[in-house]
Interface confidence: low
């Protein structure tokens, strides 16, 4: 079949005591095979820092997954998504300031 | 192997500026960050900044944001470090570095001595 | 700003004997982001040891590194002729990245 690229968008939502959680979800992507991983100052961090939700499909024949970390509040611009598809790899950054979302179509 | 090959030495008048390169070798240039860190005669380690050669993210340490310009060239895989208004408190070594599992240094530049001086 | 204090600043002995160099940091630091660094002379600084024990490619088992919290050391178990150096404290934790001033371990 034919390669669909993922859409990534990263996220944060704020908790408690000045940290907050990053989400970097991969979605409408095909075939089913990704990676995914945070990376902070470019490097991956290690595999009990970061949690990953299952590659599931989304109803479209495509499939949806992601990865999230929890970093301290302020030091968002050290972190950024890693995502590897079908030969095709993209870095995504934390949005800054007040905007909480950044996605971006890969081709 | 991994390297990291830097520009000779260089002696500048105070308010000038000065540019350093570092040409990494042995992995893929994008693939890792390029820290920048300098190092006064008989003194400590102070880090610059570093930049993501892959996305050109740059992060500055304040105390050098106004002064200091990280750059990469991902056509000749090389980073810069070009330093501006030099005076004589900047004569020191100038490190590039790669980054390492949890922000460490990992592979380290031979240096670059900047001579400031009138 | 997290300020790494190492002590003593210059450490005399001889080849054989153990040192210990501590490092200790202003706030408290996660133990994954505290690294040392060796220099000697005239060449650049060379990773040690990285997240607060786990020694580095090719450093020998006579190094290691322990602690937590704000507090941190480097013991050199029987000091060989080539260990006479500077060491570097360096946490990544947060921004600014930041180094120790150093130990100097000279012979005695």
């Known amino acids: 079949g034919s390669t669909v690229p993922p859409m990534v968008n990263v996220t944060c939502s704020e908790v408690s005591e000045g940290n907050i959680t990053v989400t970097c979800r991969a979605s409408s992507f095909y075939p089913r095979n990704i990676t995914l991983t945070w990376r902070q100052d470019g490097v991956s961090l290690s595999h009990n820092t970061q949690q990953w939700g299952d590659v599931l499909p989304d109803g479209n024949g495509t499939y949806q997954t992601w990865v999230a970390t929890r970093i301290r509040q302020g030091e968002e611009q050290r972190f950024t998504c890693y995502m590897e598809h079908s030969g095709n790899h993209g870095t995504h950054p934390v949005p800054s300031g007040n905007s909480h979302h950044h996605h971006h179509h890969h081709h | 192997e991994i390297q990291l090959v830097q520009s000779g030495a260089e002696v500048k008048k105070p308010g000038s500026s000065v540019k350093v390169s570092c040409k990494p070798s042995g992995y893929a240039f994008t693939s890792n960050n390029i820290y920048w860190v300098r190092q006064a005669p008989g003194q400590g380690l102070e880090w610059i900044g570093y930049?993501?050669?892959?996305?050109?993210?740059?992060i500055y340490n304040q105390q050098f944001k106004d002064r200091a310009t990280l750059t990469v060239d991902k056509s000749t895989s090389t980073a810069y470090m070009e330093l501006s208004s030099l005076r004589s408190e900047d004569t020191a070594v100038y490190y590039c570095?790669?980054?390492?599992?949890?922000?460490?240094?990992?592979?380290w530049g031979q240096g670059t001595l900047v001579t400031v001086s009138s | 700003e997290i300020v790494l204090t190492q002590s003593p600043a210059t450490l005399s002995l001889s080849p054989g004997e153990r040192a210990t160099l501590s490092c200790s940091a202003s706030s408290s630091i996660s133990s994954n982001y505290l690294h040392w660094y060796q220099q000697k002379p005239g060449q650049s600084p060379r990773l040690l040891i990285y997240r607060t024990s786990n020694l580095a490619s090719g450093v020998p088992a006579r190094f290691s590194g322990s602690g937590s919290g704000t507090d941190y050391t480097l013991t050199i178990s029987s000091l060989e002729p080539e260990d006479f150096a500077v060491y570097y404290c360096q946490q990544g934790g947060s921004l600014p990245l930041t180094f120790g001033q150093g130990t100097k371990v000279e012979i005695k």
């Open positions: 930049i993501d050669p892959y996305i050109g993210r740059i």
């Open positions: 570095s790669r980054s390492g599992e949890r922000s460490n240094f990992d592979y």
